[in-house]
C-alpha cells in the first residue's frame, strides 16, 4: 500500500451487573424467581467493531467501510482491563490504505458468545460514536453509560512507520544513498544531511563560488569544471593550446595583449619597443608583425645602424690622437699623456703620475 | 579536519555485550548521521547500520538487527553501537563512517573479539 | 539486497603495469558505485565515487567507469604504494553492499 495507518480500539472495562443481554433475556438461561437476577451463568463476553464513513445520524447497516474485527471472548459480566494495557485480546486493529479522513462513525457492539453451534450469539449492549479524531500517539476514552451495560473504551489512529500528516499520507524514510541524504522531521519533512539540497536532497551543494555555469559537483564542497574551462570555481576558460600572450573569453580563444599579433599571439607587433634594436641614434619603426626598420643618423648604415661609414671625418680623436677607421667605427690611438675612447683624459688627472712611453689607444662605436 | 575515533573494542564471551563508542570531531555532528562498518579477520567490509543525524531513525544489517542498538549523543559528538548477544561471528574490526558522502570519512577502527 | 561481486580476487602485477578490477552488480545500481583502496591495519580509503568520479587527493592513474551493472577500477601505471586491497561498493540503496575485495600483490 501506498499509505500507512491504522485505527486502534482496546476495550477498557464491562458492567454487565445483572448479565443481561439487550433483549432483556439472561445471558446464562433463566432468571433468579426471587431477586430477578441471572444466577445460572455469566455472559461469556466479547466485542465487534464496524468503522465507516461519517454519518451525522447513524445508521446501524451498510458496510463497515472503513474495516471491521472483532475479539475474542474476553471476560464475564463485569471486569476491568485498564492494567493489562496492551494485552492483544482486547484490542482490535483496523489498518488501512488511504489517507485516514480524520471524521468516522465507529460502531461498538458487546455480545455473548452461547459456546453453541446451534443457539447463535447474542447482543448485549451497542454503541455507536461519530467524530473527527487526528493521529497521535494519545489515546481517547469513551464511554458506554445508557443501557443494560456500560462499557468502556479507547481509540486512537495511528500512522505506520514512515507515514505523517493528518491523512497518514505522507511518506519520509531517512536515507543515505542515491536517492536522498536525509533525515525526517516530526511533521515528514526531509531534512537534508549538510552538503545536500533539493526536494529529495540528493543534490550536492558544490564548492562556495563554484561556477554555476561551468562547475558542477557529485560530492558536496566540490567543483568539476565542464570541458573547456578550469580554476578553483571553474570560472577561467582554457585557451587555445599554444597560445603565448593571449587570453581568453571563450574557451579555446586567444585574444593577443596589447602589442601582440598572430593566430598564437606570438608575434611582436612592436618590436622597436621591446627589443630597441636600432644602434648609434637611429630611429625604428613598426613595419609588421615580429618586424620592424631603422633609419639611421648620417655616417651610420646596417639593418640596426651597426656599421659607421667615414667615422674619421668628424676628427673624433683629440689631443692629437690619430684617427683610424675601423668595421665598427673608428679607433683612436692618443699621444702619450692622454687616453680614453677620444684621448680626452689626461693620464696625470687619472693616476696623478706621468708615464713614459707611448700613449692608449681605444675603440669606438 | 575531519576525524572519527572508536573505541571500546576487546574480548568478550559468546552472549555477552559490549558498547563501541564513535567520538567525531571537525564537522557539525548533527548534521550528518554515522554509519557503522565491521571487517572480520581476513574477509571483506560489512555494512551494519547507520542513525540520522537528529538520532530519530537507525536502520540495521540482517545479521545485527534486533542485538545490536546504534544511538548518538549530539552534546558529545558521540555514536555508539551496544552489542547484546554477541557470536563468534561478530568477531571484526569496528569502523564507523560519516554518512552523507559516501564513506570518504572513517575511523581508524577498534577490534572486537568473541570468544571464550 | 544488492549484490556486488570483484574480479579477480588476486592478482600479481609489476611495477609500471596497467592494471583493471571489474565488478559487477546483481541489478542496476546507475552510477552509484564507488571504489576503495585498504592497506593492512588501516581504514578504508575512498578513491573513486558515482563510478568515475576521482575523490579528492587522490591520484590521476586511478580511473573508474562504467554504469548500470558492470564498473571498473584501473590504475593506469602501478606504483609501489598501490599494492593492496581493492572494495567496490554500491550506495544505490540501503543497505550499502561491498563487493569481496581484490588483492593486488607485487609480482
Known amino acids: 500500500a501506498d499509505l500507512g495507518s491504522q485505527f486502534e480500539l482496546e476495550i477498557l472495562s464491562m458492567q454487565n451487573v445483572n448479565g443481561e443481554l439487550q433483549n432483556g433475556n439472561c445471558c446464562g438461561g433463566v432468571r433468579n424467581p426471587g431477586d430477578r437476577k441471572c444466577t445460572r451463568d455469566e455472559c461469556d463476553t466479547y466485542f465487534k467493531v464496524c468503522l465507516k464513513e461519517y454519518q451525522s445520524r447513524v445508521t446501524a447497516g451498510g458496510p463497515c467501510s472503513f474495516g471491521s474485527g472483532s475479539t475474542p471472548v474476553i471476560g464475564g459480566n463485569t471486569f476491568n482491563l485498564k492494567a493489562s494495557r496492551g494485552n492483544d485480546r482486547n484490542r482490535i486493529v483496523l489498518p488501512f490504505s488511504f489517507a485516514w479522513p480524520r471524521s468516522y462513525t465507529l460502531l461498538v457492539e458487546a455480545w455473548d458468545s452461547s459456546n453453541d453451534t446451534i443457539q447463535p450469539d447474542s447482543i448485549i449492549e451497542k454503541a455507536s460514536h461519530s467524530g473527527m479524531i487526528n493521529p497521535s500517539r494519545q489515546w481517547q476514552t469513551l464511554k458506554q453509560n445508557t443501557g443494560i451495560a456500560h462499557f468502556e473504551y479507547q481509540i486512537r489512529v495511528t500512522c505506520d512507520d514512515h507515514y505523517y500528516g493528518f491523512g497518514c499520507n505522507k511518506f519520509c524514510r531517512p536515507r543515505d544513498d542515491f536517492f536522498g541524504h536525509y533525515a525526517c522531521d516530526q511533521n515528514g519533512n526531509k531534512t537534508c544531511m549538510e552538503g545536500w539540497m533539493g526536494p529529495d536532497c540528493n543534490k550536492a551543494i558544490c564548492r562556495q563560488g563554484c561556477s554555476p555555469k561551468h562547475g558542477s559537483c557529485k560530492l558536496p564542497g566540490d567543483c568539476r569544471c565542464q570541458y573547456g574551462w578550469q580554476g578553483l570555481y571553474c570560472d577561467k576558460c582554457i585557451p587555445h593550446p599554444g597560445c603565448v600572450h593571449g587570453t581568453c573569453n571563450e574557451p579555446w580563444q586567444c585574444l593577443c595583449e596589447t602589442n601582440w599579433g598572430g593566430q598564437l599571439c606570438d608575434k611582436d607587433l612592436n618590436y622597436c619597443g621591446t627589443h630597441q634594436p636600432c644602434l648609434n641614434r637611429g630611429t625604428c619603426s613598426n613595419t609588421g608583425p615580429d618586424k620592424y626598420q631603422c633609419s639611421c643618423p648620417e655616417g651610420y648604415s646596417g639593418p640596426n645602424c651597426e656599421i659607421a661609414e667615414h667615422a674619421c671625418l668628424s676628427d673624433p680623436c683629440h689631443n692629437r690622437g690619430s684617427c683610424k677607421e675601423t668595421s665598427s667605427g673608428f679607433e683612436c690611438e692618443c699621444s702619450p699623456g692622454w687616453t680614453g675612447p677620444t684621448c680626452s683624459t689626461n693620464i696625470d688627472d687619472e693616476f696623478g703620475l706621468v708615464p713614459r712611453g707611448s700613449g692608449h689607444h681605444h675603440h669606438h662605436h | 579536519e575531519v576525524q572519527l575515533v572508536e573505541s571500546g573494542g576487546g574480548l568478550v564471551q559468546p552472549g555477552g555485550s559490549l558498547r563501541l563508542s564513535c567520538a567525531a570531531s571537525?564537522?557539525?555532528?548533527?548534521?550528518?548521521?554515522i554509519h557503522w562498518v565491521r571487517q572480520a579477520p581476513g574477509k571483506g567490509l560489512e555494512w551494519v547500520g547507520w542513525?540520522?543525524?537528529?538520532?530519530?531513525?537507525?536502520d540495521y544489517a540482517d545479521s545485527v538487527k534486533g542485538r545490536f542498538t546504534i544511538s548518538a549523543d549530539t552534546s558529545k559528538n558521540t555514536a555508539y553501537l551496544q552489542m547484546n548477544s554477541l557470536r563468534a561471528e561478530d568477531t571484526a574490526v569496528y569502523y564507523c563512517?560519516?554518512?552523507?558522502?559516501?564513506?570518504?570519512?572513517w575511523g581508524q577502527g577498534t577490534l572486537v573479539t568473541v570468544s571464550s | 539486497d544488492i549484490q556486488m561481486t570483484q574480479s579477480p580476487s588476486s592478482l600479481s602485477a609489476s611495477v609500471g603495469d596497467r592494471v583493471t578490477i571489474t565488478c559487477r552488480a546483481s541489478?542496476?545500481?546507475?552510477?552509484?558505485v564507488a571504489w576503495y583502496q585498504q592497506k593492512p591495519g588501516k581504514a578504508p580509503k575512498l578513491l573513486i565515487y558515482?563510478?568515475?568520479f576521482l575523490y579528492s587527493g587522490v591520484p590521476s592513474r586511478f580511473s573508474g567507469s562504467g554504469s548500470g551493472t558492470d564498473f571498473t577500477l584501473t590504475i593506469s601505471s602501478l606504483q609501489p604504494e598501490d599494492f593492496a586491497t581493492y572494495y567496490c561498493?554500491?550506495?544505490?540503496?540501503?543497505?550499502?553492499?561491498f563487493g569481496q575485495g581484490t588483492k593486488v600483490e607485487i609480482k
Open positions: 563512517a560519516r554518512a552523507g558522502s559516501w564513506f570518504a570519512y
Open positions: 571537525g564537522f557539525t555532528f548533527s548534521n550528518y548521521g
Open positions: 542513525i540520522t543525524p537528529d538520532g530519530g531513525y537507525t
Open positions: 541489478q542496476d545500481v546507475s552510477t552509484a
Open positions: 558515482s563510478a568515475s
Open positions: 561498493q554500491q550506495s544505490y540503496t540501503t543497505p550499502p553492499t
